[in-house]
């Protein structure tokens, strides 16, 4: 062992360094001492640091790690951040889109229903909005209180405009009459499906995302312990009290004690990998039915086709619904909603410029791109912290915690550190309460991610319709279906590309669901089908 | 008011055939279904098919196959069933019916008897 | 096919007895997406036209008395008649709408003592 540079004999340097943690000199040697009562930086022979000192270098420490660890997530932490509120704001203004739409599809093709289904179709997408941001409503509910309130519409104002007003009383019968009936055949179902399937999985990625934030706050705010602070105190300062004011820690002997007080941390990285691939899983299949931009922007078309249903069977309705609705006392169904005031949400839409007039998939992609950067961020926290503080290259003529060594040499330091503190004791601990938590928060998350992912080929259930469609009135590729009907289906593809250049006002002529619109090629209500014993078509 | 009015009583001979009508009055049979209901004496009752006479699509029993043709006169407000190649087991009354949409059979023609021999 | 199953296939009652009547159906008969049971009950009195009583298993039709009353779900339905009079004298039929081909039940005939 080289034998220690003599020490400044009046701690001098050490005084002027310890000036800038704390002002005043009251704890400082102004000559080295025995320092017995030393507790981390335990002397060789005489140093220039007090028991005072120490535990200020301790707070030191401790201060530096925690901001050594936030300057470490920060680009993680603002990558996500930024996507969470880039995402919900872009999904807020699907859904504003996707209602302007079906309110136009009203506007242009039932002006007679305007004012009640701008209604209806706002507390529908209200309903949308607050179920994305995780509000505890039911998709299923949501569609029926929608077809619901349209059915007795519908049938007072277009099936049977002359309708005395004595007769508008049977709102709550035409209500019931709705689901009885199947008045608007398999639309509805297609419609939950759909909506139910597409805004589960946005709601799960938003929700993944603000759990990612949460996971980086929390690690971001860790307290280290008070063992880890010694260990950090000893590697950082404790060369200060021997005046070896220009020494480096050994980059092996960082590595060993970020280790140690990172352990708990770095328990997390199983399931922050986990998260990243099961995130990467579920972004890979929010398509097609998956796909609420997808969905939600070909609703109108399903609502109209769903319309036109219910008129081309308006003859065998009215004979039903005259014999149910005639005496609708008979018949007790939940109490329909007409607030006095409607609101028309008659607001011209501008959506916000969309850079590279991207998509919401594309960007979803690029975020996964950027995040598997990240997949290692926890396993590599160590490593990145001792390469962003200052560590001696090569582990040569460095500190070692306890002396200046010309190699560091990780044994040597475990055996001289024994008795001062035990590394495999911090390890053991285990993780903080706060760590053990996120992770059952990630594990929860990543549960989710998965029963969410999508499974690989068709992805809508083959038997949607108990009813016996007589054949798939979407063709071959039902997932791909949004307009609910065999020709003049529309297809939505690269929505947001062509919302970045769209101005879109209810007034538009052209509105979608103007012209070329689909009914379904087959009726399933007006129609005997041949096929044997299936679920019957007629009822 | 509703009503169905079936044609009277048919006496023919085996191997001939038939055709039995239910004209409707108080509604228009574009909108319901008109099926065809056979009662053996002292038997049960026993579906025959139907028919949607907007489109004239049509649904029957295999237990007819080729026995029953149901078909319908919007014109004359009118449903037909048309019996062929009978036998003595053809033998019944035969019931006209009004199906709304979503509901069963709630208006019944008075029936016709057709008798099967020789 | 989906089979009806009637019983009993007779039953002689007094007028002001109270009677039940059972169907069984060899499938369900309940549709998921609006909970309706898709059975009927008919009364057919000698001489006549069956007459539609009970639809969706338990809704009583237009003008038929309240003393009817249909209960069920599923695959096991009953028709019940309070304080049978002796207008009630009829062959009592289930029927299913919820498949093609419909079925009906070979029937109760129910006689007044």
């Known amino acids: 062992q080289p034998p220690p540079p003599p020490p400044d004999a009046t701690c001098h340097q050490v005084r002027s360094f310890f000036q800038r943690l704390q002002p005043g000199l009251k704890w400082v040697p102004e000559t080295p001492v025995p320092g017995s009562d030393l507790q981390v930086c335990l002397p060789k022979g005489p140093t220039c640091c007090s028991r005072k000192m120490e535990e200020k270098y301790q707070l030191t420490a401790r201060l530096n790690m925690e901001q050594l660890l936030q300057s470490a997530s920060m680009e993680l932490k603002f990558l996500i951040i930024q996507n969470a509120a880039v995402f919900q704001e872009a999904f807020e203004i699907v859904v504003r889109h996707a209602k302007n739409y079906t309110n136009a599809m009203f506007k242009n093709n039932y002006p007679s229903l305007t004012p009640q289904a701008f209604e209806f179709v706002g507390e529908f997408f209200t309903d949308v909005s607050l179920y994305i941001l995780g509000s505890d409503i039911n998709v299923d509910d949501m569609v029926n209180e929608l077809f619901d309130s349209l059915f007795p519409v519908i049938y007072t104002q277009l099936m049977n405009p002359g309708l005395p007003d004595s007769a508008l009383d049977i709102n709550e019968c035409l209500r019931g009459a709705r689901r009885d009936l199947k008045v608007f055949g398999n639309f509805p179902k297609l419609i939950m499906t759909q909506v139910s399937k597409s805004l589960q999985v946005t709601r799960i990625f938003l929700q993944a995302l603000n759990l990612g934030i949460e996971v980086i706050n929390t690690t971001d705010h860790l307290k280290f312990s008070k063992d880890c602070g010694r260990m950090l105190t000893r590697m950082w300062y404790c060369s200060y009290c021997q005046g070896l004011m220009m020494v480096k820690p050994c980059g092996g002997y960082c590595n060993v004690v970020m280790q140690g007080c990172m352990a708990g941390v770095v328990e997390i990285d199983k399931y922050w990998r986990e998260y990243i691939l099961s995130l990467e899983e579920l972004v890979n299949g929010m398509y097609r039915i998956y796909d609420m931009e997808n969905v939600l922007l070909g609703l109108f078309s399903t609502i109209h086709d769903s319309i036109q249903y219910v008129q081309k069977n308006a003859g065998k309705l009215t004979t039903t619904i005259g014999k149910l609705c005639a005496h609708s006392q008979q018949r007790q169904y939940r109490s329909a909603y007409y607030p006095e005031d409607l609101f028309i949400d008659k607001k011209v839409l501008k959506v916000a410029h969309v850079e590279h007039e991207e998509t919401l998939s594309s960007r979803r992609r690029e975020l996964i791109q950027k995040l598997k950067s990240f997949i290692s961020f926890y396993s590599a926290l160590p490593g990145y912290i001792c390469s962003h503080s200052p560590v001696a290259e090569n582990d040569t003529l460095c500190w070692n915690g306890q002396e200046l060594v010309e190699r560091y040499s990780q044994k040597a330091a475990r055996n001289g550190m024994k008795n001062q503190f035990n590394l495999h004791e911090l390890k053991m601990k285990g993780p903080e309460p706060v760590v053990s938590q996120i992770i059952d928060k990630l594990k929860h998350i990543n549960q989710l991610l998965r029963t969410m992912s999508m499974p690989k080929g068709r992805v809508l259930d083959k038997n949607l319709d108990e009813e016996g469609f007589e054949s798939g009135d979407c063709g071959d590729d039902e997932d791909e279906c949004i307009g609910g009907s065999g020709d003049g289906m529309i297809k939505v593809k690269n929505q947001l590309r062509f919302l970045a250049e769209l101005a879109y006002d209810l007034d538009v002529d052209d509105a979608p669901g103007n012209s070329q619109q689909a009914t379904p090629k087959d009726n399933e209500i007006s129609t005997f089908h041949n096929l044997g014993n299936v679920h019957s078509p007629l009822k | 008011e509703v009503q169905l009015q079936q044609s009277g009583a048919e006496h023919v001979k085996p191997g001939t055939s038939v055709r039995l009508s239910c004209t409707a009055s108080?509604?228009?049979?574009?909108?319901?279904?008109i099926h065809w209901v056979k009662q053996r004496p002292e038997q049960g009752l026993e579906w025959i098919g139907g028919i949607d006479p907007e489109n004239d699509n049509t649904e029957y029993d295999p237990k007819f196959p080729g026995k029953a043709t149901v078909v319908a006169d919007t014109s004359s407000n009118t449903a037909y069933l048309q019996l062929s190649s009978l036998t003595s087991e053809d033998t019944a009354v035969y019931y006209c019916?009004?199906?709304?949409?979503?509901?069963?059979?709630?208006?019944w023609g008075q029936g016709t008897t057709l008798t099967v021999s020789s | 096919d989906i089979v009806l199953s009637q019983s009993p296939s007779s039953l002689a009652v007094s007028v002001g007895e109270n009677v039940t009547m059972n169907c069984k159906s060899s499938q369900r008969l309940l549709d998921s997406s609006n909970q309706r049971n898709y059975l009927a009950w008919y009364q057919q009195k000698p001489g006549q036209s069956p007459q539609l009583l009970i639809f969706?298993?338990?809704t009583r039709e237009s003008g038929v008395p309240d003393r009817f009353t249909g209960s069920g779900s599923g695959t096991d339905f009953t028709l019940t008649i309070r304080s049978v009079k002796a207008e009630d004298l009829a062959v009592y039929y289930c029927?299913?709408?919820?498949?093609?081909?419909?079925?009906f039940g070979s029937g109760t005939k129910l006689e007044i003592k």
């Open positions: 108080g509604f228009n049979i574009k909108d319901a279904y």
């Open positions: 969706w298993a338990s």
């Open positions: 029927q299913q709408y919820y498949s093609y081909p419909f079925t």
């Open positions: 019916a009004r199906r709304p949409l979503g509901l069963p059979f709630d208006y």
